[in-house]
Interface confidence: low
Protein backbone atom coordinates (compact mmCIF):
# COMPACT_ATOMS: atom_id res chain seq x y z
CA UNK A 1 0.00 0.00 0.00
CA UNK A 2 1.36 3.41 -0.80
CA UNK A 3 0.19 6.98 -0.66
CA UNK A 4 -1.16 8.05 -4.00
CA UNK A 5 -0.11 11.16 -5.83
CA UNK A 6 -1.96 14.03 -4.24
CA UNK A 7 -3.00 17.34 -5.69
CA UNK A 8 -3.18 20.40 -3.45
CA UNK A 9 -6.70 21.09 -2.28
CA UNK A 10 -8.46 23.61 -4.50
CA UNK A 11 -11.09 25.81 -2.97
CA UNK A 12 -14.16 26.27 -5.12
CA UNK A 13 -14.23 29.64 -6.86
CA UNK A 14 -16.35 32.34 -5.37
CA UNK A 15 -19.99 32.22 -6.39
CA UNK A 16 -20.62 34.03 -9.61
CA UNK A 17 -17.08 33.73 -10.84
CA UNK A 18 -17.26 30.25 -12.20
CA UNK A 19 -18.79 31.50 -15.44
CA UNK A 20 -19.01 29.25 -18.43
CA UNK A 21 -16.17 27.05 -17.19
CA UNK A 22 -17.51 24.38 -14.91
CA UNK A 23 -15.67 23.33 -11.78
CA UNK A 24 -14.55 20.11 -13.41
CA UNK A 25 -13.13 21.94 -16.41
CA UNK A 26 -11.31 24.24 -14.04
CA UNK A 27 -9.62 21.55 -12.00
CA UNK A 28 -8.53 19.43 -14.95
CA UNK A 29 -6.24 22.03 -16.56
CA UNK A 30 -4.78 22.77 -13.14
CA UNK A 31 -3.95 19.13 -12.57
CA UNK A 32 -2.61 18.75 -16.09
CA UNK A 33 -0.53 21.88 -15.73
CA UNK A 34 1.15 20.60 -12.59
CA UNK A 35 1.73 17.26 -14.27
CA UNK A 36 3.31 18.94 -17.26
CA UNK A 37 5.49 21.13 -15.06
CA UNK A 38 6.74 18.17 -13.03
CA UNK A 39 6.86 15.59 -15.79
CA UNK A 40 10.63 15.81 -16.14
CA UNK A 41 11.39 15.99 -12.43
CA UNK A 42 12.97 12.91 -10.90
CA UNK A 43 11.47 11.30 -7.84
CA UNK A 44 12.69 8.91 -5.20
CA UNK A 45 10.38 6.46 -3.47
CA UNK A 46 11.06 4.65 -0.24
CA UNK A 47 9.31 1.62 1.21
CA UNK A 48 9.94 0.34 4.70
CA UNK A 49 8.73 -3.12 5.61
CA UNK A 50 8.77 -4.84 8.96
CA UNK A 51 8.58 -8.61 9.04
CA UNK A 52 5.65 -9.89 11.05
CA UNK A 53 7.64 -12.89 12.23
CA UNK A 54 10.54 -10.85 13.52
CA UNK A 55 9.87 -7.31 14.63
CA UNK A 56 13.54 -6.36 14.57
CA UNK A 57 13.83 -7.27 10.90
CA UNK A 58 13.29 -4.51 8.36
CA UNK A 59 13.43 -4.38 4.60
CA UNK A 60 13.98 -1.02 2.95
CA UNK A 61 13.32 -0.64 -0.75
CA UNK A 62 14.11 2.49 -2.71
CA UNK A 63 13.70 3.46 -6.29
CA UNK A 64 14.59 6.31 -8.57
CA UNK A 65 12.01 7.56 -11.02
CA UNK A 66 13.92 9.56 -13.54
CA UNK A 67 15.43 9.29 -16.96
CA UNK A 68 18.99 9.77 -15.79
CA UNK A 69 21.46 7.03 -15.07
CA UNK A 70 22.27 6.17 -11.48
CA UNK A 71 25.89 6.44 -10.38
CA UNK A 72 25.45 5.75 -6.67
CA UNK A 73 22.85 4.82 -4.06
CA UNK A 74 23.42 5.43 -0.36
CA UNK A 75 21.08 4.05 2.30
CA UNK A 76 21.27 5.49 5.79
CA UNK A 77 19.25 5.59 8.96
CA UNK A 78 18.73 8.08 11.72
CA UNK A 79 18.41 10.92 9.23
CA UNK A 80 20.00 11.88 5.93
CA UNK A 81 23.53 10.79 5.22
CA UNK A 82 25.74 13.68 6.18
CA UNK A 83 23.12 15.15 8.53
CA UNK A 84 23.50 12.85 11.47
CA UNK A 85 22.53 9.70 9.64
CA UNK A 86 24.50 6.49 9.72
CA UNK A 87 25.33 4.80 6.45
CA UNK A 88 23.95 1.30 6.12
CA UNK A 89 24.93 0.52 2.54
CA UNK A 90 26.49 2.04 -0.54
CA UNK A 91 25.65 0.58 -3.94
CA UNK A 92 27.75 1.48 -6.94
CA UNK A 93 26.75 0.18 -10.36
CA UNK A 94 30.29 -0.84 -11.27
CA UNK A 95 32.29 -1.27 -8.11
CA UNK A 96 29.65 -3.25 -6.33
CA UNK A 97 28.01 -3.07 -2.93
CA UNK A 98 29.22 -2.51 0.58
CA UNK A 99 27.17 -2.63 3.73
CA UNK A 100 27.59 -2.25 7.46
CA UNK A 101 25.88 -3.87 10.43
CA UNK A 102 23.04 -4.20 11.03
CA UNK A 103 22.52 -4.34 7.27
CA UNK A 104 22.38 -7.98 6.22
CA UNK A 105 21.80 -7.91 2.49
CA UNK A 106 21.85 -5.00 0.09
CA UNK A 107 21.16 -5.65 -3.55
CA UNK A 108 20.02 -4.11 -6.81
CA UNK A 109 16.47 -5.11 -7.70
CA UNK A 110 16.44 -3.29 -11.02
CA UNK A 111 18.77 -0.77 -12.57
CA UNK A 112 16.87 1.94 -10.74
CA UNK A 113 15.80 0.31 -7.47
CA UNK A 114 17.50 -1.36 -4.55
CA UNK A 115 16.56 -3.28 -1.44
CA UNK A 116 18.25 -3.64 1.90
CA UNK A 117 17.50 -6.17 4.62
CA UNK A 118 18.25 -4.94 8.10
CA UNK A 119 18.34 -7.23 11.06
CA UNK A 120 19.21 -6.88 14.68
CA UNK A 121 18.36 -7.66 18.23
CA UNK A 122 18.78 -5.67 21.39
CA UNK A 123 20.96 -2.62 20.97
CA UNK A 124 21.47 -3.19 17.27
CA UNK A 125 17.78 -3.49 16.47
CA UNK A 126 16.13 -0.72 14.47
CA UNK A 127 13.15 0.84 16.18
CA UNK A 128 9.72 1.14 14.63
CA UNK A 129 10.16 4.90 14.45
CA UNK A 130 13.55 4.79 12.79
CA UNK A 131 13.90 6.97 9.72
CA UNK A 132 15.53 5.37 6.71
CA UNK A 133 16.87 7.48 3.87
CA UNK A 134 17.88 6.65 0.32
CA UNK A 135 20.03 8.96 -1.71
CA UNK A 136 20.39 8.52 -5.45
CA UNK A 137 23.17 10.26 -7.33
CA UNK A 138 22.29 10.36 -10.99
CA UNK A 139 23.42 11.99 -14.18
CA UNK A 140 22.31 14.57 -15.14
CA UNK A 141 19.73 15.27 -12.43
CA UNK A 142 22.09 15.47 -9.49
CA UNK A 143 21.51 14.13 -6.00
CA UNK A 144 18.05 13.11 -4.79
CA UNK A 145 17.16 11.80 -1.38
CA UNK A 146 14.00 10.64 0.30
CA UNK A 147 13.33 9.28 3.76
CA UNK A 148 10.63 7.11 5.23
CA UNK A 149 9.76 5.29 8.40
CA UNK A 150 7.19 2.83 9.63
CA UNK A 151 3.89 4.10 11.02
CA UNK A 152 4.37 4.03 14.78
CA UNK A 153 1.07 2.48 15.85
CA UNK A 154 0.64 -0.36 13.39
CA UNK A 155 0.67 -4.04 14.12
CA UNK A 156 2.55 -5.83 11.36
CA UNK A 157 1.09 -9.16 12.35
CA UNK A 158 -2.47 -7.97 11.94
CA UNK A 159 -2.28 -5.56 9.06
CA UNK A 160 -0.10 -7.68 6.87
CA UNK A 161 -1.37 -8.37 3.38
CA UNK A 162 0.08 -11.57 1.95
CA UNK A 163 2.21 -9.77 -0.60
CA UNK A 164 3.56 -6.26 -0.97
CA UNK A 165 1.42 -3.89 -2.97
CA UNK A 166 2.49 -2.94 -6.49
CA UNK A 167 5.64 -0.91 -6.59
CA UNK A 168 6.48 1.91 -8.96
CA UNK A 169 9.01 0.75 -11.53
CA UNK A 170 11.17 3.11 -13.53
CA UNK A 171 11.72 0.68 -16.35
CA UNK A 172 11.41 1.58 -20.00
CA UNK A 173 7.78 0.56 -20.37
CA UNK A 174 6.79 2.62 -17.36
CA UNK A 175 8.66 5.66 -18.54
CA UNK A 176 7.21 5.44 -22.03
CA UNK A 177 3.70 4.85 -20.69
CA UNK A 178 3.82 7.76 -18.27
CA UNK A 179 5.49 9.98 -20.85
CA UNK A 180 2.74 9.18 -23.33
CA UNK A 181 0.00 10.01 -20.86
CA UNK A 182 1.73 13.25 -19.85
CA UNK A 183 2.33 14.23 -23.44
CA UNK A 184 -1.31 13.68 -24.23
CA UNK A 185 -2.28 15.63 -21.11
CA UNK A 186 -0.05 18.54 -22.02
CA UNK A 187 -1.47 18.67 -25.53
CA UNK A 188 -4.98 18.52 -24.13
CA UNK A 189 -4.15 21.27 -21.66
CA UNK A 190 -2.93 23.52 -24.45
CA UNK A 191 -6.13 22.78 -26.31
CA UNK A 192 -8.21 23.74 -23.25
CA UNK A 193 -6.22 26.88 -22.65
CA UNK A 194 -6.68 28.01 -26.24
CA UNK A 195 -10.39 27.21 -26.04
CA UNK A 196 -10.88 29.22 -22.88
CA UNK A 197 -8.42 32.05 -23.29
CA UNK A 198 -11.16 34.60 -23.95
CA UNK A 199 -13.33 33.55 -21.05
CA UNK A 200 -13.16 35.23 -17.64
CA UNK A 201 -10.68 33.39 -15.45
CA UNK A 202 -12.04 32.38 -12.06
CA UNK A 203 -10.07 33.40 -9.00
CA UNK A 204 -8.84 30.58 -6.84
CA UNK A 205 -8.80 30.87 -3.09
CA UNK A 206 -5.46 29.71 -1.82
CA UNK A 207 -5.79 26.69 0.41
CA UNK A 208 -4.71 27.31 3.98
CA UNK A 209 -5.63 23.90 5.22
CA UNK A 210 -2.99 21.66 3.68
CA UNK A 211 0.51 23.08 4.06
CA UNK A 212 2.08 19.82 2.99
CA UNK A 213 5.62 19.36 1.83
CA UNK A 214 6.01 18.11 -1.70
CA UNK A 215 5.53 14.38 -1.61
CA UNK A 216 3.36 13.70 -4.61
CA UNK A 217 4.24 13.86 -8.24
CA UNK A 218 1.28 16.03 -9.09
CA UNK A 219 2.48 18.99 -7.07
CA UNK A 220 5.66 20.89 -7.70
CA UNK A 221 5.89 24.02 -5.58
CA UNK A 222 7.88 26.94 -6.81
CA UNK A 223 11.31 27.62 -5.42
CA UNK A 224 9.84 30.36 -3.32
CA UNK A 225 7.30 28.11 -1.67
CA UNK A 226 9.91 25.40 -1.39
CA UNK A 227 12.18 27.73 0.53
CA UNK A 228 9.46 28.22 3.08
CA UNK A 229 9.60 24.51 3.81
CA UNK A 230 13.16 24.52 5.07
CA UNK A 231 12.85 23.33 8.63
CA UNK A 232 15.35 21.86 11.07
CA UNK A 233 15.59 18.14 10.56
CA UNK A 234 13.59 16.63 13.39
CA UNK A 235 14.83 13.09 13.59
CA UNK A 236 14.29 9.96 15.55
CA UNK A 237 14.94 8.49 18.91
CA UNK A 238 18.69 8.09 18.91
CA UNK A 239 18.58 5.19 21.32
CA UNK A 240 17.97 3.02 18.29
CA UNK A 241 21.35 3.72 16.76
CA UNK A 242 23.23 0.74 15.36
CA UNK A 243 25.61 -1.33 17.39
CA UNK A 244 27.29 -4.34 15.88
CA UNK A 245 25.57 -7.43 14.67
CA UNK A 246 27.29 -10.80 14.45
CA UNK A 247 24.50 -13.10 13.36
CA UNK A 248 21.79 -12.71 10.78
CA UNK A 249 19.02 -15.12 9.93
CA UNK A 250 16.60 -14.94 7.04
CA UNK A 251 12.95 -14.57 7.90
CA UNK A 252 9.92 -15.35 5.83
CA UNK A 253 6.29 -14.78 6.54
CA UNK A 254 3.83 -12.04 5.74
CA UNK A 255 4.85 -8.45 5.74
CA UNK A 256 3.40 -4.99 5.41
CA UNK A 257 4.64 -1.97 3.58
CA UNK A 258 4.87 1.70 4.27
CA UNK A 259 5.58 3.09 0.86
CA UNK A 260 6.45 6.70 0.42
CA UNK A 261 6.69 8.02 -3.11
CA UNK A 262 8.33 11.38 -2.68
CA UNK A 263 8.68 14.24 -5.07
CA UNK A 264 11.70 16.47 -4.97
CA UNK A 265 11.65 19.87 -6.57
CA UNK A 266 14.90 21.30 -7.88
CA UNK A 267 16.57 23.67 -5.45
CA UNK A 268 19.89 24.60 -6.98
CA UNK A 269 20.26 27.65 -4.80
CA UNK A 270 21.92 25.99 -1.84
CA UNK A 271 23.20 22.85 -0.17
CA UNK A 272 21.04 20.13 1.30
CA UNK A 273 17.86 21.93 2.25
CA UNK A 274 15.42 19.65 3.97
CA UNK A 275 11.67 19.67 3.93
CA UNK A 276 9.94 17.27 6.26
CA UNK A 277 6.27 16.63 6.75
CA UNK A 278 4.26 14.06 8.62
CA UNK A 279 1.84 12.23 6.36
CA UNK A 280 -1.63 12.35 7.87
CA UNK A 281 -2.96 9.07 9.21
CA UNK A 282 0.26 7.24 8.38
CA UNK A 283 2.75 8.50 10.88
CA UNK A 284 5.48 8.29 8.30
CA UNK A 285 8.15 10.81 7.56
CA UNK A 286 9.30 12.09 4.23
CA UNK A 287 12.29 14.21 3.40
CA UNK A 288 13.47 15.27 0.02
CA UNK A 289 16.59 16.88 -1.31
CA UNK A 290 18.23 17.80 -4.52
CA UNK A 291 21.87 18.61 -4.05
CA UNK A 292 23.36 19.62 -7.35
CA UNK A 293 27.00 18.72 -7.78
CA UNK A 294 29.46 21.23 -6.47
CA UNK A 295 31.08 22.07 -9.75
CA UNK A 296 27.97 21.57 -11.88
CA UNK A 297 30.27 19.30 -13.85
CA UNK A 298 29.04 16.60 -16.15
CA UNK A 299 28.03 13.30 -14.68
CA UNK A 300 29.06 10.37 -16.81
CA UNK A 301 26.60 8.84 -19.24
CA UNK A 302 26.26 5.17 -18.59
CA UNK A 303 23.76 2.39 -18.62
CA UNK A 304 20.63 3.61 -16.92
CA UNK A 305 17.07 2.51 -16.37
CA UNK A 306 15.49 1.04 -19.46
CA UNK A 307 18.66 0.99 -21.52
CA UNK A 308 21.02 -1.95 -21.87
CA UNK A 309 19.97 -4.65 -19.46
CA UNK A 310 22.64 -6.79 -17.89
CA UNK A 311 22.04 -10.07 -16.07
CA UNK A 312 23.51 -8.27 -13.08
CA UNK A 313 21.83 -4.85 -12.90
CA UNK A 314 25.05 -3.37 -11.57
CA UNK A 315 26.60 -3.58 -14.99
CA UNK A 316 29.18 -5.58 -16.91
CA UNK A 317 32.06 -5.15 -14.48
CA UNK A 318 30.15 -5.45 -11.23
CA UNK A 319 32.10 -8.39 -9.92
CA UNK A 320 35.52 -7.04 -10.85
CA UNK A 321 34.89 -3.89 -8.85
CA UNK A 322 36.69 -3.70 -5.53
CA UNK A 323 33.78 -3.36 -3.20
CA UNK A 324 31.50 -6.29 -3.85
CA UNK A 325 30.23 -7.74 -0.59
CA UNK A 326 30.20 -11.47 -1.08
Amino acid sequence: MRTEAQVPALQPPEPGLEGAMGHRTLVLPWVLLTLCVTAGTPEVWVQVRMEATELSSFTIRCGFLGSGSISLVTVSWGGPNGAGGTTLAVLHPERGIRQWAPARQARWETQSSISLILEGSGASSPCANTTFCCKFASFPEGSWEACGSLPPSSDPGLSAPPTPAPILRADLAGILGVSGVLLFGCVYLLHLLRRHKHRPAPRLQPSRTSPQAPRARAWAPSQASQAALHVPYATINTSCRPATLDTAHPHGGPSWWASLPTHAAHRPQGPAAWASTPIPARGSFVSVENGLYAQAGERPPHTGPGLTLFPDPRGPRAMEGPLGVR
Epitope: R98, W100, F139, G297
Partner: antibody, heavy 118, light 107 residues
Framework: EVQLVESGGGLVQPGGSLRLSCAAS????????MHWVRQATGKGLEWVAG???????YYPGSVKGRFTISRENAKNSLYLQMNSLRAGDTAIYYC????????????WGQGTTVTVSS | DIQMTQSPSSLSASVGDRVTITCRAS??????LGWYQQKPGKAPKRLIY???SLQSGVSSRFSGSGSGTEFTLTISSLQPEDFATYYC?????????FGGGTKVEIK
Amino acid sequence: EVQLVESGGGLVQPGGSLRLSCAASGFTFSRDDMHWVRQATGKGLEWVAGIDNAGETYYPGSVKGRFTISRENAKNSLYLQMNSLRAGDTAIYYCAREGQWPYGMDVWGQGTTVTVSS
Amino acid sequence: DIQMTQSPSSLSASVGDRVTITCRASQGIRNDLGWYQQKPGKAPKRLIYSASSLQSGVSSRFSGSGSGTEFTLTISSLQPEDFATYYCLQSNSYPLTFGGGTKVEIK
Protein backbone atom coordinates in the same frame (compact mmCIF):
# COMPACT_ATOMS: atom_id res chain seq x y z
CA GLU B 1 42.39 14.58 13.04
CA VAL B 2 42.45 11.87 10.38
CA GLN B 3 45.97 10.50 10.21
CA LEU B 4 47.93 7.63 8.65
CA VAL B 5 51.47 6.81 9.74
CA GLU B 6 53.56 4.25 7.87
CA SER B 7 56.49 2.31 9.32
CA GLY B 8 58.64 -0.74 8.55
CA GLY B 9 60.59 0.54 5.58
CA GLY B 10 64.30 -0.08 5.20
CA LEU B 11 67.05 -1.70 3.21
CA VAL B 12 66.57 -5.28 2.08
CA GLN B 13 68.38 -7.59 -0.31
CA PRO B 14 66.78 -8.84 -3.52
CA GLY B 15 64.67 -11.88 -2.79
CA GLY B 16 64.17 -10.75 0.79
CA SER B 17 61.03 -9.83 2.69
CA LEU B 18 59.72 -6.80 4.51
CA ARG B 19 56.53 -5.98 6.34
CA LEU B 20 55.13 -2.45 6.26
CA SER B 21 52.62 -1.17 8.79
CA CYS B 22 50.21 1.73 8.73
CA ALA B 23 48.63 3.06 11.90
CA ALA B 24 45.32 4.83 11.36
CA SER B 25 43.61 7.28 13.66
CA GLY B 26 40.84 9.86 13.61
CA PHE B 27 38.28 7.84 11.64
CA THR B 28 36.37 4.57 11.76
CA PHE B 29 39.06 2.40 10.26
CA SER B 30 36.92 -0.73 9.88
CA ARG B 31 34.46 1.03 7.57
CA ASP B 32 36.87 2.24 4.96
CA ASP B 33 38.86 0.65 2.16
CA MET B 34 42.60 0.97 2.46
CA HIS B 35 45.40 0.97 -0.10
CA TRP B 36 49.13 0.92 -0.57
CA VAL B 37 50.59 3.15 -3.29
CA ARG B 38 54.25 3.42 -4.16
CA GLN B 39 56.45 5.90 -5.96
CA ALA B 40 59.94 5.22 -7.24
CA THR B 41 62.35 8.16 -7.20
CA GLY B 42 61.49 10.56 -10.00
CA LYS B 43 58.62 8.36 -11.17
CA GLY B 44 54.86 8.46 -10.97
CA LEU B 45 52.41 6.92 -8.53
CA GLU B 46 51.63 3.21 -8.73
CA TRP B 47 48.82 1.46 -6.88
CA VAL B 48 50.19 -1.64 -5.16
CA ALA B 49 47.37 -3.24 -3.15
CA GLY B 50 43.90 -2.62 -1.81
CA ILE B 51 41.66 -4.15 0.83
CA ASP B 52 38.00 -3.37 1.29
CA ASN B 53 36.06 -3.16 4.51
CA ALA B 54 35.01 -6.80 4.18
CA GLY B 55 38.62 -7.94 3.93
CA GLU B 56 38.58 -8.63 0.20
CA THR B 57 42.02 -7.99 -1.29
CA TYR B 58 43.12 -6.67 -4.69
CA TYR B 59 46.50 -6.43 -6.44
CA PRO B 60 47.93 -5.35 -9.78
CA GLY B 61 49.70 -7.98 -11.82
CA SER B 62 53.12 -6.57 -10.96
CA VAL B 63 52.95 -7.66 -7.31
CA LYS B 64 50.34 -10.42 -7.30
CA GLY B 65 51.67 -13.49 -5.54
CA ARG B 66 54.49 -11.56 -3.90
CA PHE B 67 52.71 -8.93 -1.83
CA THR B 68 49.93 -9.48 0.69
CA ILE B 69 47.77 -6.71 2.12
CA SER B 70 45.94 -7.28 5.39
CA ARG B 71 44.21 -5.31 8.08
CA GLU B 72 43.63 -5.60 11.79
CA ASN B 73 40.58 -3.52 12.58
CA ALA B 74 40.92 -3.95 16.35
CA LYS B 75 44.30 -2.25 16.15
CA ASN B 76 43.38 0.25 13.41
CA SER B 77 46.29 -1.13 11.46
CA LEU B 78 47.01 -1.92 7.82
CA TYR B 79 49.87 -4.13 6.69
CA LEU B 80 51.77 -4.96 3.53
CA GLN B 81 53.82 -8.14 3.55
CA MET B 82 56.36 -7.97 0.71
CA ASN B 83 58.17 -11.14 -0.33
CA SER B 84 60.56 -11.96 -3.16
CA LEU B 85 61.54 -8.33 -3.36
CA ARG B 86 63.21 -6.98 -6.48
CA ALA B 87 65.21 -3.85 -7.22
CA GLY B 88 62.19 -2.53 -9.07
CA ASP B 89 60.24 -2.52 -5.81
CA THR B 90 62.44 0.24 -4.45
CA ALA B 91 60.17 3.18 -3.72
CA ILE B 92 58.38 5.27 -1.15
CA TYR B 93 55.33 3.33 0.00
CA TYR B 94 52.25 5.31 0.98
CA CYS B 95 49.28 4.10 2.94
CA ALA B 96 46.01 5.69 1.78
CA ARG B 97 42.40 5.64 2.83
CA GLU B 98 39.44 5.40 0.52
CA GLY B 99 36.29 6.59 2.28
CA GLN B 100 32.76 5.26 1.93
CA TRP B 101 32.12 7.70 -0.87
CA PRO B 102 33.29 9.18 -3.12
CA TYR B 103 35.78 6.64 -4.39
CA GLY B 104 39.39 7.63 -4.60
CA MET B 105 42.03 8.06 -1.95
CA ASP B 106 41.34 11.07 0.20
CA VAL B 107 43.85 10.66 3.04
CA TRP B 108 47.48 9.71 2.63
CA GLY B 109 50.32 8.95 5.01
CA GLN B 110 53.72 10.55 4.60
CA GLY B 111 55.29 7.36 3.30
CA THR B 112 58.03 4.94 4.26
CA THR B 113 61.06 4.20 2.09
CA VAL B 114 61.87 0.69 0.91
CA THR B 115 65.22 0.08 -0.75
CA VAL B 116 65.95 -3.26 -2.39
CA SER B 117 69.65 -3.54 -3.09
CA SER B 118 72.49 -5.93 -2.69
CA ASP C 1 43.20 -2.95 -17.09
CA ILE C 2 42.19 0.65 -17.56
CA GLN C 3 45.04 2.81 -18.82
CA MET C 4 45.10 6.47 -17.90
CA THR C 5 46.92 8.69 -20.38
CA GLN C 6 47.77 12.09 -18.97
CA SER C 7 48.96 15.03 -21.01
CA PRO C 8 51.09 16.99 -21.19
CA SER C 9 53.80 15.26 -19.18
CA SER C 10 55.19 18.68 -18.28
CA LEU C 11 54.41 22.31 -18.92
CA SER C 12 55.89 25.69 -18.16
CA ALA C 13 53.60 28.49 -17.11
CA SER C 14 53.63 31.84 -15.35
CA VAL C 15 51.78 33.02 -12.29
CA GLY C 16 48.30 34.08 -13.33
CA ASP C 17 48.16 31.72 -16.32
CA ARG C 18 45.25 29.43 -16.97
CA VAL C 19 46.48 25.85 -17.02
CA THR C 20 44.67 22.79 -18.39
CA ILE C 21 45.72 19.18 -17.87
CA THR C 22 43.89 16.30 -19.50
CA CYS C 23 43.48 12.65 -18.65
CA ARG C 24 42.09 10.04 -21.03
CA ALA C 25 40.83 6.65 -19.88
CA SER C 26 41.16 3.63 -22.16
CA GLN C 27 37.53 2.77 -21.38
CA GLY C 28 34.59 4.51 -19.77
CA ILE C 29 34.97 5.14 -16.05
CA ARG C 30 31.80 7.19 -15.47
CA ASN C 31 32.97 9.97 -13.17
CA ASP C 32 35.16 7.84 -10.93
CA LEU C 33 38.19 10.03 -11.32
CA GLY C 34 40.21 12.15 -8.93
CA TRP C 35 42.95 14.73 -9.39
CA TYR C 36 45.92 14.88 -7.04
CA GLN C 37 48.67 17.40 -6.43
CA GLN C 38 52.09 16.32 -5.21
CA LYS C 39 54.97 18.50 -4.17
CA PRO C 40 58.54 17.19 -3.81
CA GLY C 41 59.01 15.11 -0.67
CA LYS C 42 55.33 15.24 0.19
CA ALA C 43 52.41 12.85 -0.07
CA PRO C 44 49.80 13.44 -2.76
CA LYS C 45 46.85 15.64 -1.89
CA ARG C 46 43.44 15.23 -3.47
CA LEU C 47 42.08 18.31 -5.23
CA ILE C 48 39.08 16.98 -7.15
CA TYR C 49 36.90 13.90 -6.67
CA SER C 50 34.14 12.42 -8.79
CA ALA C 51 35.67 14.20 -11.80
CA SER C 52 34.25 17.61 -10.98
CA SER C 53 33.73 18.03 -7.23
CA LEU C 54 36.12 20.21 -5.30
CA GLN C 55 37.73 18.62 -2.26
CA SER C 56 36.99 20.47 0.95
CA GLY C 57 39.65 23.03 1.77
CA VAL C 58 40.96 23.23 -1.78
CA SER C 59 41.05 26.57 -3.58
CA SER C 60 38.24 27.21 -6.05
CA ARG C 61 40.75 28.09 -8.75
CA PHE C 62 40.98 24.33 -9.26
CA SER C 63 38.17 22.76 -11.22
CA GLY C 64 37.54 19.46 -12.90
CA SER C 65 35.29 18.40 -15.74
CA GLY C 66 34.60 15.49 -18.01
CA SER C 67 33.01 12.09 -17.87
CA GLY C 68 33.38 8.70 -19.44
CA THR C 69 36.85 8.77 -20.96
CA GLU C 70 37.90 12.43 -21.22
CA PHE C 71 38.74 14.48 -18.13
CA THR C 72 40.25 17.88 -17.54
CA LEU C 73 41.82 19.64 -14.58
CA THR C 74 41.89 23.42 -14.89
CA ILE C 75 43.77 25.91 -12.76
CA SER C 76 42.10 29.21 -13.54
CA SER C 77 44.91 31.45 -12.35
CA LEU C 78 48.17 29.77 -11.47
CA GLN C 79 49.64 30.72 -8.10
CA PRO C 80 53.22 30.22 -6.85
CA GLU C 81 52.12 27.37 -4.58
CA ASP C 82 50.55 25.52 -7.52
CA PHE C 83 53.88 24.55 -9.09
CA ALA C 84 53.86 20.81 -8.49
CA THR C 85 53.12 17.51 -10.19
CA TYR C 86 49.51 16.56 -10.86
CA TYR C 87 48.10 13.05 -11.23
CA CYS C 88 44.74 11.67 -12.17
CA LEU C 89 43.47 8.43 -10.61
CA GLN C 90 40.67 6.22 -11.87
CA SER C 91 38.84 4.44 -9.08
CA ASN C 92 36.16 2.84 -11.22
CA SER C 93 37.57 -0.68 -11.20
CA TYR C 94 40.58 -2.63 -10.07
CA PRO C 95 43.41 -2.38 -10.67
CA LEU C 96 43.28 1.29 -9.75
CA THR C 97 45.47 3.24 -12.14
CA PHE C 98 47.12 6.64 -12.10
CA GLY C 99 47.97 8.86 -14.99
CA GLY C 100 51.66 9.36 -15.69
CA GLY C 101 51.66 12.81 -14.09
CA THR C 102 52.02 16.38 -15.30
CA LYS C 103 54.81 18.52 -13.90
CA VAL C 104 53.87 22.19 -13.80
CA GLU C 105 57.02 24.31 -13.77
CA ILE C 106 57.69 28.02 -13.58
CA LYS C 107 58.33 29.61 -16.98
